[in-house]
């Protein structure tokens, strides 16, 4: 079921794949340590090595059952049909100290599994509890959560999930905090992480709000955790801009949700809307996110520290059609100190008593928010009044690349030496590599340097991965994984091509003539030996610059710039004609054309000259790294007066013999010469 | 052409506030960041601190945090570097300069604006 | 703070001859990337410093190939290869790789 490794799409060298055609993919991890990889579908839960080679299937289904039967049949007999149902993954995490993987489908209500990493044999599927049925919704990337393992050697692990309900707000809250007990058959795995009567670690979707707005649900895009919080991304429907009509037109609104992780009541749920606009259009569709740090370069930039957290972005154009989003999309940067920042203002206004606490979808009633003498800092986690709390000017974000044409799907990002990487998957199946840099030519905040296919005409999805050596790009649709290599530095034959790449991975490794990572360069960190600049790119002059066909072993003197330390010797290479010695001396090359008798091979039937390279060669590495165009001229070739003393080499027109010759003395002294036109 | 250009000399009285300020020129100011350094008479360079030009983060030298204050303009694309409670060592040629890509090397650096502390 | 230090404090050099002058830190300067922040900077008479080398051995442009940056970790050297009368002035190394950025105590350049 699964196919064997093929090529990539374009004209790339293959990229490693795997397929699996019966079923469709919905999630990827990686596993930091070993980089073994581990793939949600329908029906199935894939590992595979590093390489994409596959090591296990687990069978997830299909299943009998029915959406309606709660709880699920194998709970209780259940008076609807039963069929053959896919079970469809909807949330994959690894949960490294439990060694275990978390696999959530869609079938039996959202019940989920745990496998054990080695060999994805099912250590438990809890399913006898209410806690345990996360939600019966069959779309894949519509669920998100935060795996936060306990404090070492006590305290439990535990595990804060949203998902949307489907309008069963009585069987499915749309977020809450759960946990994840060590023995997967334990009777409170799942369990809120607080519950009384009044108040527990969950959010539910009040009745009130379905009634008014059937369709209305929560899509939970990408979810992180940063400091002491959870963030959401989430859509949703926005309640302001749509009519309760159910045949009028629906508007979305992205949201950034944020929780602290040790705040087992909910106090501290926050809400703002979030998006980022360029040039007046408005992005407010949320794609995908993917946390980062900010790279050496672009945290200077921006102010901040390097351990400083930054979350890239993508939204689609406007807010409507949520499953099928305009193409027009956008990569956009936020920082989490200015999200924290906005979050903070907030709070600290509605503890003035200032505006109300505006969420409209979860508080039924507009409620005021209440003057309190509190000290709102940046960690503060709420009290049991001004909650929940929703922002209501949009967080806006920098808008670093817009795609008209081919939609963004997806991103990742990290750090190169110093340098802002981000990987955008798109609608046709393509990765697209962008620097991000606020010091771009042109003023450009994000400069798209390649564009690679992953699978042709297939959407990417969500999870973009990066291996843990960060050689490599998972990016996965829903019929196949493919590893796209970070850099294809190889691929650039001259240095030129090679810096004028922009690729931040590549730099010219100048004795060995090629294109490479710095790690990959012999003793790059020596002098001049790895150009990471257009401007170091090996620079070649010779005097005389051309020898006419008859002159043999004529002294040159080549001159170079961007050199390293030569001293372990240089050969001046005549393509691959000749090679002779050089001499250095006073930073210069010395070295001597080739022999008369070698020079005929080589001008033989090519007119009145021949362009030649004239390279230097390495003795260190038997590499030509440098080369500078040389002139082999043959005056001998013109017949006329005009052609010979006209063309652009020193020849000379035998008056009386009716020669081109270069050299004076082959005229006789009586019988003259020319060596500019005479009327 | 990119350049940095500073306000003239002062003198100033001690337990007085300075500010200096800083135009740059020919290239994207929010894109880089500023650093200010300065050279008291006859000595050698000490880094200030630095501020995006972007965003006004800032990050100062720990021996100046209370007394020095950055801060930029962007419409103007200026600079301003304000020390407080000057003291006759602050007596120094105040420079302004460009971080590079990295932020890790100065490129650009202004001409300088001498500031005398004295009673 | 990180203590850059630089020999010799002053270098009388005939013109078109070598000069080299070294520069040390108290700790290693390769940073977390994988980069080493050290720059060198020229400052002539009665002018603003100016940045020659940066990276190590990165020259910046408009710097002419005689000055040639090398070192690792603690030890660093800027050489140049033939000095010219323009070359007269005090050199400077400067870490930016932890905070707070640190300058050389400074070499002078004149010419014998």
């Known amino acids: 079921e699964a196919g064997l490794p093929r090529a990539g799409g374009g004209s790339q060298p293959p990229f490693r794949t795997f397929s699996a055609s019966d079923w469709g993919l919905t999630h990827l991890v990686v596993h930091e340590q070993t980089g073994e990889v581990y793939v949600g579908a329908v029906n199935r839960i894939y590992k595979l090595s590093g390489n994409l080679t596959l090591l296990r299937a687990h069978v997830t289904g299909p299943v009998e059952d029915n959406e309606k039967c709660y709880p699920p049949p194998s709970v209780q007999s259940c008076p609807h049909g039963l069929g053959s149902t896919d079970n469809v993954n909807k949330l994959l995490l690894l949960d490294y100290a439990a060694n275990r993987l978390l696999a959530c489908g869609s079938a039996s209500q959202g019940i989920c599994q745990f496998l054990r990493l080695d060999d994805l044999f099912k250590l438990g599927e809890p399913h006898h509890r209410k806690e345990h049925y996360l939600s019966s919704v069959q779309e894949a990337g519509s669920m998100a959560g935060v795996l936060i393992a306990g404090p070492p050697g006590q305290g439990q692990a535990k595990l804060f999930v949203g998902t949307p309900i489907d309008g069963k707000s009585e069987y499915f809250p749309t977020l809450s905090s759960r946990r994840l007990m060590a023995n997967e058959e334990d009777a409170d795995m799942f369990g809120f992480v607080y519950q009384d009567e009044f108040v527990s670690s969950q959010l539910k979707i009040p009745s009130d709000t379905l009634s008014k707005f059937p369709a209305f649900d929560i899509y939970y895009v990408y979810s992180f955790r940063s400091e002491q919080f959870v963030y959401y991304l989430t859509l949703q429907l926005d309640t302001q801009l749509t009519s309760p009509d159910a045949a009028g037109e629906h508007f979305f609104t992205s949201k950034i949700v944020r929780l602290c992780v040790d705040d087992p009541k909910f106090y501290s749920y926050v809400e703002f809307p979030i998006g980022c606009e360029q040039a007046g259009v408005e992005y407010r569709l949320v794609q995908d996110a993917y946390l980062s740090r900010p790279g050496r370069a672009l945290a200077h930039q921006l102010g901040l520290a390097e351990d400083e957290d930054v979350l890239f972005t993508v939204f689609a154009q406007g807010q409507k059609n949520r499953v099928k989003p305009p193409k027009e999309s956008a990569l956009c940067l936020f920082t989490l100190r200015a999200i924290k920042e906005k979050i903070k203002e907030r709070i600290q206004s509605c503890y003035r008593g200032e505006g109300k606490l505006s969420l409209p979808w979860l508080l039924n009633k507009e409620l005021g928010c209440i003057n309190s003498p509190l000290q709102i800092d940046d960690d503060f986690c709420g009290q049991d009044f001004n909650q929940p709390l929703g922002g209501t000017v949009t967080i806006e974000g920098t808008p670093l690349f817009v795609d008209k044409d081919d939609g963004l799907t997806a991103v990742a990002a990290y750090d190169y030496r110093g340098r802002t990487v981000v990987f955008a998957g798109t609608r046709s199946g393509r990765i697209r590599k962008i620097l991000v840099d606020l010091s771009n030519p042109g003023g450009r905040p994000a400069l798209a340097y390649e564009s690679v296919v992953a699978q042709e005409g297939s959407p990417i999805l969500r999870d973009l991965v990066l291996s843990p050596n960060h050689q490599y790009l998972y990016a996965m649709t829903e019929k196949q994984v493919t590893r796209v290599p970070v850099e294809s530095c190889v691929q650039y034959t001259s240095c030129e091509l090679c810096l004028g790449s922009r690729d931040p991975h590549c730099g010219w490794c100048v004795l060995h003539s090629i294109c490479s990572r710095r790690d990959a360069c012999e003793r790059a960190d020596e002098p001049q030996r790895f150009a990471a600049d257009l401007l170091q790119c090996v620079q070649l002059t010779v005097q005389p610059r051309n020898v006419s066909v008859t002159m043999s072993q004529v002294p040159l003197v080549l001159q170079a710039w961007n050199v390293p330390d030569l001293s372990a010797g240089v050969n001046c290479s005549f393509e691959d004609f000749t090679e002779s010695e050089s001499v250095l001396e006073d930073g210069r090359i010395h070295c001597r054309s080739p022999s008369a008798r070698e020079v005929a091979p080589i001008t033989r039937g090519q007119g009145d000259q021949r362009v030649v390279k004239l390279y230097l060669k390495s003795k260190e590495t038997g590499k030509k790294f440098a080369s500078v165009d040389f002139v082999f001229y043959n005056c001998s070739v013109h017949q006329s007066c005009l052609s010979c003393v006209n063309g652009s080499f020193p020849c000379h027109w035998c008056k009386y013999r009716h020669v081109c010759t270069h050299n004076v003395a082959d005229c006789a002294f009586l019988e003259g010469r020319v060596n500019v036109s005479e009327d | 052409e990119v350049q940095l250009v500073q306000s003239g000399a002062e003198v100033k009285k001690p337990g007085a506030s300075v500010k200096v300020s800083c135009k740059a020129s020919g290239y994207t100011f929010t894109s880089y960041g500023i650093s200010w350094v300065r050279q008291a008479p006859g000595q050698g360079l000490e880094w200030m601190g630095w501020i995006s030009a972007y965003n006004g983060n800032t990050n100062y030298a720990q021996k100046l945090q209370g007394r020095v204050t950055m801060t930029t303009d962007t419409s103007t694309s200026t600079a301003y570097m304000e020390l407080r409670s000057l003291r006759s060592d602050d007596t120094a040629v105040y420079y302004c300069?460009?971080?590079?890509?990295?932020?890790?090397?100065?490129?650009?650096w202004g001409q300088g604006t001498m500031v005398t502390v004295s009673s | 703070d990180i203590v850059m230090t630089q020999t010799p404090l002053s270098s009388p050099v005939t013109l078109g001859q070598p000069a080299s002058i070294s520069c040390r830190s108290s700790q290693s300067l390769v940073h977390s990337d994988g980069n080493t922040y050290l720059s060198w900077l020229q400052q002539r008479p009665g002018q603003p410093p100016r940045l020659l080398i940066y990276?190590?051995?990165n020259r910046f442009s408009g710097v002419p190939d005689r000055f040639r940056g090398s070192g690792a970790g603690t030890d660093f050297t800027l050489k140049i290869s033939r000095v010219e009368a323009e070359d007269v002035g005090v050199y400077y190394c400067?870490?930016?790789?932890?905070?707070?950025?640190?300058f050389g105590q400074g070499t002078s350049l004149e010419i014998k």
């Open positions: 300069a460009r971080g590079g890509r990295g932020g890790d090397a100065f490129d650009i």
């Open positions: 400067m870490q930016a790789t932890h905070f707070p950025w640190t």
């Open positions: 990276q190590i051995s």
